[in-house]
Each structure stands twice: as structure tokens, then as C-alpha cells.
């Protein structure tokens, strides 16, 4: 569950569950800072707009990652 | 299957302290946001406190501000809520519930059977 | 803070009729951020409604939510004896308090 705010992290839960990379709107990797001492992933769906908060640590959605970058890399000249 | 059981309530004075417990099991505890949410005798709900998963974000109603502290162990898969400087008016069942941790926010799923909070003298 | 209100206060209903409960918030909510709870006495609140429309696992689909921005609606399209109860909304905005509103009560006719 995201959370809008300026200082501490932006996560209050975290899913393991994977993300279709085709219904994903948005994928932001924010890093670990000052206001947040672990890096936060937050998936934006492209139906509703709907946002989630990925687990990191999780296989699946390392997996994920793995697959968004390939297909950025495929579509870069 | 997924549960959440509260203890830790009885009749305590007014400025003593009392610590609640809610034990969890059947999910992956140390993923979810946490909350506790309190009804006083023949009243509404009254959205308490929440920590996120990792204990990182700590929020509090105004009414409990300064005065009731939540924490957690995801080793010991509990969620605790210390109340100091307890009131009359905190007389009431407290219940701990999840944060649906699948997506944004999609309300308190699973909720705890409650444990009874009464503040007398 | 947002304030929720709901109306009616109590609403007296006949096994079979439409219960049409109403939430309205002093300001503009996400529709993501507005969920629906029924409590029957001695028990804890059960999630009926997420996302404002969406139902939660297990719920039957005599409920239905609508609405966005500051009103909002739970209907039950056609009451069960089960289904009288305290319903509460609540709001779930981009930081705390996620208060509740004041709760309609469905009771029998």
C-alpha cells in the first residue's frame, strides 16, 4: 500500500505476488536515502491507475525487474 | 487459515498503563501494514494507530498521540500497542487488523476477534 | 482531517427491499481510497467493498459500491436476513487519520 509523504518511507505493505510487465503502466525503483533506509519498488497499473508496492527481496519480482529491463534494453536503439 | 487473536485488555486505572498483543498466523505477517482500530461501548469505530511492515512508519490517531506507542516483532509474528497514561475515555474493545498488503489500498481484511479495554477507577 | 458523514443514521428495511446507504466526505477522496464494512453485534467489522466499487473476496453481489470524489454509495439490492447490521464507510487518503464515518444501521422493519 503506497503512502504519500514527505519524510519516511513510502511502502506500509509489500506483495510477492508478480506483475504482468504488459499491465504495467509504471514501474518506479526508488533508493534507499536519507528519508528511507531501503529501496522501495511501486508498480502503477494501467487499469485504475491502481499502485503497489513490490517486495524487492522477492524471486518474483527480481524476475520482474529482469524482464522490464530487457525489454527497455530491446527497445532502445 | 489466516487469524489474528488480541490479549492483553482488562480494567486498569485511570494514568496506569496496559500493553495489547495480537498474535498472527496463516500469512506472511512480516509483508503487511498492521492496524488497531477501537470501538468504545455502543459507539463507532475509531481508526487508532498503523505501522508499516517493517516498523519503518509509525501513525497515530490525535486522540492517542504521544500517549500510545504501536510496535511489532515479525520474528514473533505480533503486533503490540502500548497505552500509557490511559483515560476514561479509552474504555474500549480494540481489535488489530491487516492491511491488505495485494495492491494499494484495499481496506482492513482480515480483523481480530477484539480484547475489552476498560479504564476505571 | 477528512470528516465522513453517513446517512441515514438508521434505516428500517423489510427482508427482500433495496438498502441504499450514502457516505460523504468533506473533501474529495480517491475512489482507490473508500472502503465499506459490515459489524453485527459482538463481532468485528468485515470488509464488504474496497476501491470504492470493488468486492472483497467472499462477498455477495447483492452488495455493490459507487461513487467518487465525496459521495459515495453502498447498495444492498435485495436484503437477506443476514444483512442487518452496522455498515461503516472509511477513507484511506494520502496520509492518516483513515477515519471511519459514524456507521448506517440496517435494521428489520
Known amino acids: 500500500v503506497p503512502l504519500s509523504r514527505t519524510v519516511r518511507c513510502t511502502c506500509i505493505s509489500i506483495s510477492n505476488q508478480p506483475v504482468n510487465p504488459r499491465s504495467l503502466e509504471k514501474l518506479e525503483i526508488i533508493p534507499a536515502s536519507q528519508f528511507c533506509p531501503r529501496v522501495e519498488i511501486i508498480a502503477t497499473m494501467k487499469k485504475k491507475g491502481e499502485k503497489r508496492c513490490l517486495n524487492p527481496e522477492s524471486k518474483a519480482i527480481k524476475n520482474l525487474l529482469k524482464a522490464v529491463s530487457k525489454e527497455r534494453s530491446k527497445r532502445s536503439p | 487459515q489466516v487469524q489474528l487473536v488480541e490479549s492483553g485488555g482488562g480494567v486498569v486505572q485511570p494514568g496506569r498503563s496496559l500493553r495489547l498483543s495480537c498474535a498472527a498466523s496463516?500469512?506472511?505477517?512480516?509483508?503487511?501494514?498492521m492496524h488497531w482500530v477501537r470501538q468504545a461501548p455502543g459507539k463507532g469505530l475509531e481508526w487508532v494507530a498503523l505501522?508499516?511492515?517493517?516498523?519503518?512508519?509509525?501513525y497515530y490517531a490525535d486522540s492517542v498521540k504521544g500517549r500510545f506507542t504501536i510496535s511489532r516483532d515479525n520474528s514473533k509474528n505480533t503486533l503490540y500497542l502500548q497505552m500509557n497514561s490511559l483515560r476514561a475515555e479509552d474504555t474500549a474493545v480494540y481489535y488489530c487488523a491487516r492491511d491488505w498488503p495485494e495492491g494499494y489500498y484495499n481496506g482492513m481484511d482480515v480483523w481480530g476477534q477484539g480484547t475489552t479495554v476498560t479504564v476505571s477507577s | 482531517e477528512i470528516v465522513l458523514t453517513q446517512s441515514p443514521g438508521t434505516l428500517s428495511l423489510s427482508p427482500g427491499e433495496r438498502a441504499t446507504l450514502s457516505c460523504r466526505a468533506s473533501?474529495?477522496?480517491?475512489?482507490?481510497?473508500l472502503a465499506w464494512y459490515q459489524q453485527k453485534p459482538g463481532q468485528a467489522p468485515r470488509l464488504l467493498i474496497y476501491g470504492a466499487s470493488s468486492r472483497a473476496t467472499g462477498i455477495p453481489d447483492r452488495f455493490s459500491g459507487s461513487g467518487s470524489g465525496t459521495d459515495f454509495t453502498l447498495t444492498i439490492s435485495r436484503l437477506e436476513p443476514e444483512d442487518f447490521a452496522v455498515y461503516y464507510c472509511q477513507q484511506y487518503g494520502s496520509s492518516p487519520p483513515f477515519t471511519f464515518g459514524p456507521g448506517t444501521k440496517v435494521d428489520i422493519k
Open positions: 496463516g500469512f506472511t505477517f512480516s509483508n503487511s501494514g
Open positions: 473533501q474529495s477522496v480517491s475512489s482507490s481510497y
Open positions: 505501522i508499516g511492515f517493517d516498523g519503518i512508519n509509525e
